[in-house]
């Protein structure tokens, strides 16, 4: 489409025919009026005129005459100063200059807002030589103008190292309002004021703003752009947009959702990843965050064994990663586990509770009343003990581990023996004579080895020495008994 243009500055008439601002359709007027310059409707002529190939910036032949000694200063002819058109129209404008033939090597370039236009733009320069002067018309055309084409265009001519600059041609592309700032989605606290901003520009100006909340206008009277809407507070989610109006019509911004911050939804899918005797590794899937970032989470652990206290342990942890290792648990116990997370508004409800169990643990107490003595043959050390008072939580007793350390001058060696759970006595061979044997015993379950009993020492004499006196675990308070023979 060929655009209409309005002349804002009123230059001299360019053509004897139609008035400026109307569509120019006389294709031959350019040939008959070589000195013409100014706005031309788009797509008026082909790049080259018949009979005159396009030569671009050519060297103009020197022509001397008596009248050329006092040449007037070179200047571009006055042209249309301001072109107003709608977006997506085509436009063409030009500047013209008559150059005496004595000048050579002329070039014309187009500039927009101080920057030279190079490359892809559609610029054509045509030459119309006469006896003494050559009329040069430089045309610039834009197809489907956009707002980015707005600006001040000038022609520049370099001639004999001098620069001649045309008057500016202002291109004003008008259209519907264009948003430079639209309202943004927000998450807000219930009943708390907040602001939304909307800014739109023309041309044409002015641009007026109406605010819309949930499809209903908020302000009866428009506000000039930019506009800030102060919302005193919301109790439920709302969608806001703004309408920008100018002489060309109306543009509506994107609709933005204003969410009300709430407590999060409870976490889901609490899962057990690993259980040990005293710890459980869990993970969970966070619930909806309530439009406010999670701050932290709370793992709640409740004893559920039939006669347990039911004590509730609460472990606070960061919101991510969504995993936590619960520690300090009893062995072989059942627990109910739930997770709750919080944001700035508050705590979520607790996730669905899941049941988890710890595994068997090592015994927590050592065997009691450990007694050690030499038998008559002196080849064996006889060890006796009492079964520890273990809670079943420690796991099923599978046996005992006996440590016996033999020490004499320059020798120290430790040996370990394993015996079954039904035993409460064991015999070990004498390893070294004239030495001290130190015995400790630990209970063993599938969960591991428990603590060793206090050491009991017995002296093993050289051959030929017999003594039946036992050595035993001391009464509480005696840390390191030694049987002296």
């Amino acid at each position: 489409a060929i655009t209409e243009a309005r002349e804002e500055a009123k230059p001299y008439p360019l053509f004897p025919g139609p008035l400026p601002g109307s569509l120019q359709t006389d294709h031959t007027s350019l040939l008959s009026l070589p000195h013409t310059s100014g706005y031309q409707p788009a797509l008026m002529f082909s790049p080259t005129q018949p009979g005159r190939p396009y030569t671009g910036n050519v060297a103009i032949p020197r022509v001397t005459s008596a009248g050329s000694k006092l040449l007037p200063p070179l200047a571009f002819k006055h042209t249309v100063g301001h072109i107003i058109l709608s977006e997506h129209k085509d436009v063409k404008f030009n500047c013209s200059i008559s150059v005496p033939n004595i000048y050579q090597d002329t070039t014309i370039s187009w500039w927009k807002d101080g920057k030279e236009l190079l490359g892809a733009h559609h610029a054509i320069t045509q030459f119309y030589p006469d006896d003494e002067v050559t009329a040069i018309i430089a045309s610039f055309s834009i197809t489907s103008v956009q707002r980015s084409d707005n600006g001040s265009y000038i022609c520049k001519m370099k001639i004999n190292n001098e620069e001649i600059v045309s008057d500016p041609i202002y291109i004003e592309v008008q259209g519907l309002p264009h948003f430079t700032k639209q309202p943004e989605s927000m998450n807000v606290t219930r009943n708390t004021a907040f602001n939304l901003t909307c800014q739109a520009v023309g041309p044409p100006e002015p641009v007026n703003i109406f605010w819309v909340q949930n499809s209903s206008r908020v302000n009866e009277q428009p506000e000039k752009s930019p506009s800030v809407l102060t919302v005193p507070g919301l109790t439920e989610m709302a969608v806001f947009s703004c309408e920008a109006h100018n002489d060309k019509g109306l543009t509506v911004s994107k609709g933005v959702q204003i969410n009300i911050k709430a407590i999060p939804s409870p976490p889901t899918e609490v899962s057990i990843h690993n259980s040990t005797a005293h710890s459980i590794l869990i993970s969970w899937v966070p619930g909806f965050d309530g439009y406010s970032p999670f701050r932290n989470c709370s793992v709640q652990v409740k004893e559920v064994d039939p006669l347990s206290n039911g004590s509730v342990m609460i472990f606070n942890t960061s919101a991510s990663p969504h995993m936590y290792q619960i520690k300090q648990l009893q062995a072989l116990a059942n627990y109910s586990i739930g997770v709750s997370c919080m944001n700035e508004i508050g705590w979520s409800a607790v996730s669905p509770w899941i049941l988890a169990s710890t595994t068997e643990g090592a015994p927590s107490v050592a065997p009691l009343n450990v007694t050690v003595f030499l038998n008559e043959s002196r080849d064996n050390v006889d060890i006796r003990w009492m079964k520890p008072l273990t809670k079943r939580q420690a796991g099923e007793l599978v046996g005992y581990r006996i440590s016996h350390v033999w020490q004499s001058a320059g020798i120290s060696k430790e040996l370990l023996e394993e015996v079954g759970q039904n035993n409460s006595r064991a015999q070990i061979s004498v390893q070294v004579h004239n030495a001290t044997c130190t015995v400790r015993i630990a209970a063993v379950t599938k969960g591991g080895v428990g603590p060793f009993s206090d050491p009991v020492k017995i002296f093993i004499p050289a051959h030929g020495w017999v003594d039946h006196a036992p050595s035993s675990t001391p009464a509480p308070g005696n840390a390191d008994p030694v049987l002296i023979i």
Epitope: Q300, P306, S308, G310, L389
Partner: antibody, heavy 117, light 107 residues
């Protein structure tokens, strides 16, 4: 120190309901199971059920399903047991109990519920 | 449900004698057996809890043994103040179940 306060006695008519209370003090109410136990005169003990005030989880003895309903009021640290459709078989002493360290360590003094026309 | 069978229902001993009460359970309960004493007009009092653990403050003349299904409660050197009803309670599984009780008298 831990205390569980129960009313001494309740007299109710057959077919009616009664709500026995147990006010806890001296410990964190929401941290421990609360059990209820029935003892008929001159007879043994029967476990009715338990409730956890933290999240009101309950475990009931099937024998008392429909008969006993356990609730709590966290704000007053009080546990309740409602007995419905009462008959002479429900005449008994009802104890609230909390376990500690693997045993029923703390008992209320018991509420004697008498069902009589 | 684990049933608990307690015997005897009653017994009478002279002071200084040994008392033995037995509870047998219908399922293996490990060592989750508890023993209670109840005097007239009072709530029961725990003497021994799970794992044959004597409760703090309970005289050492009270003891228990057993694991699995067979449990024994013993009072050595019975005193007149031991006159009471004695109950066992299994705490391995829900519902918790009590023995029927043993009434102890002094001759």
């Amino acid at each position: 120190q831990v205390q569980l306060q129960q009313p001494g006695a309740e007299l109710v008519k057959p077919g009616a309901s009664v709500k026995v209370s147990c006010k806890a003090s001296g410990y964190t109410f929401t941290n421990y199971w609360m059990h209820w136990v029935k003892q008929r005169p001159g007879q043994g003990l029967e476990w009715i059920g338990r409730i956890h005030p933290f999240d009101t989880e309950t475990n009931d003895n099937q024998k008392f399903k429909g008969k006993a309903t356990l609730t709590v009021d966290k704000s007053s640290s009080t546990a309740y047991m409602q007995l419905s459709s009462l008959t002479s078989e429900d005449s008994a002493v009802y104890y609230c109990v909390i376990p500690a360290n693997g045993g029923f360590a703390y008992w209320g003094q018991g509420t004697l519920v008498t069902v009589s026309a | 449900e684990t049933t608990v069978t307690q015997s005897p229902a009653s017994l009478s001993v002279a002071t200084g004698e040994k008392v033995t009460i037995r509870c047998i359970t219908s399922t293996d309960i490990g060592d989750d057996m508890n023993w209670y004493q109840q005097k007239p007009g009072e709530p029961p009092k725990v003497l021994i809890s799970e794992g044959n653990s004597l409760r703090p403050g309970v005289p050492s003349r009270f003891s228990s043994s057993g694991y699995g299904t067979d449990f024994v409660f013993t009072i050595e050197n019975t005193l007149s103040e031991d006159v009471a009803d004695y109950f066992c309670l299994q705490s391995d599984n829900l519902p918790l179940t009590f023995g029927s009780g043993t009434k102890l008298e002094i001759k």
